[in-house]
């Protein structure tokens, strides 16, 4: 139905504006939910209809027509969000997409020349949709009051139908790879966020804690509680929708996944207004930031590692709980920037902006996760440093991409475990841990290129260095090394599942008194440092001012032993 109409046009992607921008006819019939005007700049043509729009994100126009027994009526015309198959066409050649009501058929086209969407080249006769036929009469938008009334009636019908479809499809959500084609978006993904999202007057913005490509993360307050606010510019509404869709999945509540509070709109100033995700704030910051400043004893390191594995195991797991279906999810961007430290010292996985819902075995019949279009949609995601070899060399198993993406996450997890353990003094009985380094930073520095990573991790099969002293501190002296090697194995199929990582870490959690330390272990192993040796002052909360004027309180990070490296910024989401 309309859900599969290809309302891809309603989801912009944040890519650079093409050099010679395409100009398309712009029209939206009364009553159409959502708008594509954010996909371009409307040109001032006075009161004349149709209007023109200069595309921001593609060089492609689209048109949607409703063909009934006696005429074809234009429903929408405008810019596509990205250049996709069909956009190379010089003319608008519509193809049937849905039957919104008996006796009518929706046709859509994409084309790649200026104003090509003003008219279609031909439509099949209404009785036989999909077969070439004589051209139907083109109804010029705004031709007459009569036309407007007919349109209005039709769209009231359409709206009723749409409403019931949306209700029926509430469980049927589709999620997309950031910046990739949207084969079948969520029914509501085309909603105009500025209308649909409520402002939260009591939400206040304090300080920027991370600036990313698609969003700025603020620390703030909502009803007296500390929150993280992920603010998206309007051009990144697709990224907002994708991440929101994942956070809103039923059953996604877990101690070790950042908690989603609400979606809203607004900003620290009138000019900076856009869609917002309001999330739980973790004042201790990102794993990367934390490890830069603090070392952690064996118990604390294991707590971090175990909670991280638990969070990932939960994400990966497909499950039914309390009658709700939670699909398996691949994170696809696990990095120490995107993992946060909770008050109790455990981890919470954040930034689901690139996460992908995976095909399942037990999903309900109405459930259809996205089938990403082509290998690029699956492969091109994440922070390069943490990308699995099969993503770096584009050999990921596309036959079973769900399992393949889980295994790629496990590789990233292994690098995070290594980063955590590298800052554990108990694993270095002969010396204190060196300053924090990201995985592969020792070998490749702060900003490795994809070529350098490929040469190191794929061609040479090298992995971060594991000191021999790590053998000292575990139930099984080789357990840590074996665990990491089984997670970052060059062979993806040989990697452990997140659940098994959890089990193996749990088995390492308590060094057995009866287990003698190996003779090769220098000076035995030291006692654990006290539990509170890495405690951090709680954030100081100053009075909060309403949304428009940024409020001020400080999210303290504790005394800083050295400045975070450029590669590592403070990031609570």
């Amino acid at each position: 139905m309309l859900g599969s109409l290809g309302l891809w046009a309603l989801l912009p992607t944040a890519v650079e504006a093409p050099p010679n921008r395409r100009t398309c006819v712009f029209f939206e019939a009364p009553g159409v939910r959502g708008s594509t005007k954010t996909l371009g700049e409307l040109l001032d043509t006075g009161t004349e209809l149709p209007r023109a729009i200069r595309c921001l994100y593609s060089r492609c126009c689209f048109g949607i027509w409703n063909l009934t027994q006696d005429r074809a009526q234009v429903e929408m015309q405008g810019c596509r969000d990205s250049d996709e198959p069909g956009c190379e066409s010089l003319h608008c050649d519509p193809s049937p997409r849905a039957h919104p009501s008996p006796g009518s058929t929706l046709f859509t086209c994409s084309c790649g020349t200026d104003f090509c969407n003003a008219n279609y080249s031909h439509l099949p006769p209404p009785g036989s949709p999909g077969t070439p036929g004589s051209q139907g009469p083109q109804a010029a938008p705004g031709e007459s009051i009569w036309m407007a009334l007919v349109l209005l009636g039709l769209f009231l019908l359409l709206l009723l139908l749409l409403g019931s479809i949306i209700l029926a499809l509430l469980q049927r959500k589709n999620y997309r790879v950031r910046g990739e084609p949207v084969p079948e978006p969520r029914p509501d993904s085309g909603r105009d966020w500025s209308v649909e999202l409520q402002e939260l007057p009591e939400l206040c913005f304090s300080q920027v804690i991370r600036e990313g490509g698609h969003a700025v993360v603020w620390a703030g307050q909502l009803q007296g509680k500390l929150v993280a606010i992920k603010a998206f510019p309007p051009r990144s509404v697709a990224q907002f929708q994708a991440e929101r869709a994942l956070y809103e999945l039923p059953g996604l509540q877990h101690d070790h996944i950042v908690r989603f509070i609400t979606a809203s709109r607004g900003g620290p100033g009138r000019l900076l207004s856009g869609p917002l995700l309001v999330l739980e704030l973790h004042p201790k910051g990102s794993l990367c930031h934390y490890l830069t400043q603090y070392t952690s004893d064996w118990g604390s390191s294991l707590r971090m590692a175990l909670s991280l594995a638990q969070g990932l195991a939960f994400l990966h797991e497909e499950r039914w709980q309390n009658g709700q279906y939670k699909p398996g999810i691949a994170h696809r961007d696990l990095s120490s920037q995107n993992v946060l430290i909770r008050e109790d010292g455990s981890c919470a996985i954040g930034d689901l902006g690139l996460a992908l819902v995976l095909p399942g075995l037990t999903q309900p019949p109405a459930w259809t996760p996205t089938q990403p279009q082509g290998p690029a949609a699956i492969m091109e995601a994440g922070t390069q440093r943490y990308m699995a070899p099969e993503l770096l060399d584009k050999t990921l198993d596309l036959q079973d991409w769900g399992m393949a993406l889980r295994r790629a996450d496990i590789y990233s997890l292994a690098l995070l475990l290594w980063e955590i353990l590298s800052r554990c003094p108990d694993l270095r009985p002969d010396s204190s841990p060196p300053p924090f380094q990201l995985a592969y930073e020792a070998e490749l520095g702060n900003t490795p290129t994809s070529d350098e990573l490929w040469a190191l991790a794929v061609q040479e099969r090298r992995r971060p260095y594991i000191p021999s002293t790590w053998r000292c501190f575990a139930t099984d002296p080789d357990g840590l090394r074996e665990l990491l090697e089984d997670c970052w194995d060059a062979d993806p199929e040989a990697r452990l599942t997140a659940e098994c990582v959890q089990q193996r870490l749990a088995a390492l959690a308590h060094p057995q008194e009866s287990h003698p330390f190996p003779e090769s272990c220098p000076r035995g192993c030291p006692p654990l440092c006290p539990e509170d040796c890495t405690s951090i002052p709680a954030p100081t909360i100053l009075p909060c001012r309403p949304q428009r004027s940024a409020c001020h309180f400080s999210v303290q990070q504790g005394p800083c032993s050295r400045n975070p490296q450029p590669a590592c910024t403070l990031s609570p989401v």
Epitope: S468, D478, D486, D491, A494, L496, T497, C500, Q503
Partner: antibody, heavy 115, light 106 residues
Framework: QVRLVQSGAEVKKPGASVKVSCKAS????????IHWVRQAPGQRLEWMGW????????KYSQKFQGRVTITRDTSASTAYMELSSLRSEDTAVYYC????????WGQGTLVTVSS | DIQMTQSPSTLSASVGDRVTITCRAS?????IAWYQQKPGKAPKLLTY???SLKSGVPSRFSGSGSGTEFTLTISSLQPDDFATYYC?????????FGGGTKVEIK
């Protein structure tokens, strides 16, 4: 205490199949790979393949591909190795071993192929 | 396949001797493991990776090497050490063992 206990010796005719079992105890069965290694009389050890009980994935040596099938029953914490189209050269002791670089081994199962 | 060639295939030595066994790989490998096997028994892991002794293995055993050449050294041979020793590479499939070195009493 980690233990891998294998099924008893088998005598088979050429062309037949043999299925050897390996019951694991003393650890979480799904947490480690189980590998199968064989040793013909007076010969070197030969790696045959592995199964990862955590997700049931398998990997076989090209030499045995098509003839060997490794399976598992997680409820019984048991892995199985089935070798088909047996020939006299398959006479060997078959070992299961845990995937932490073979730190733990079963006691071995002698399979004799003879007409 | 990566071939692992052990030398010597047989080595006669006396208690107290220093013994060195070599394992050469036909192409570069990251790590190897060494195993000891006694007649009628399953192999026993000695070192992994390359130079780290498995817990409970006496310190007279040591492993070293990189790339294509690896050695296992027994600093002072004990009566319990007379056995056959195998190296294993797991850098690429199929995982391959060396042909074995039998250490016997002189």
């Amino acid at each position: 205490q980690v233990r891998l206990v294998q099924s008893g010796a088998e005598v088979k005719k050429p062309g037949a199949s043999v299925k050897v079992s390996c019951k694991a105890s003393g650890y979480t069965f799904t947490s480690y790979h189980i590998h199968w290694v064989r040793q013909a009389p007076g010969q070197r050890l030969e790696w045959m393949g592995w199964i990862y009980p955590g997700d049931d994935s398998t990997k076989y040596s090209q030499k045995f591909q098509g003839r060997v099938t490794i399976t598992r029953d997680t409820s019984a914490s048991t892995a199985y190795m089935e070798l088909s189209s047996l020939r006299s050269e398959d006479t060997a002791v078959y070992y299961c071993t845990r995937g932490d670089r073979f730190a733990y081994w079963g006691q071995g199962t002698l399979v004799t192929v003879s007409s | 396949d990566i071939q692992m060639t052990q030398s010597p295939s047989t080595l006669s030595a006396s208690v107290g001797d220093r013994v060195t066994i070599t394992c050469r790989a036909s192409s570069s490998v990251r790590y190897i493991a060494w195993y000891q096997q006694k007649p009628g028994k399953a192999p026993k892991l000695l070192t992994y990776p390359t130079s780290s002794l498995k817990s409970g293995v006496p310190s007279r055993f040591s492993g070293s090497g990189s790339g294509t050449e690896f050695t296992l050294t027994i600093s002072s041979l004990q009566p319990d050490d007379f056995a056959t020793y195998y190296c294993l590479q797991w850098s690429s499939y199929p995982w391959t063992f060396g042909g074995g070195t039998k250490v016997e009493i002189k």
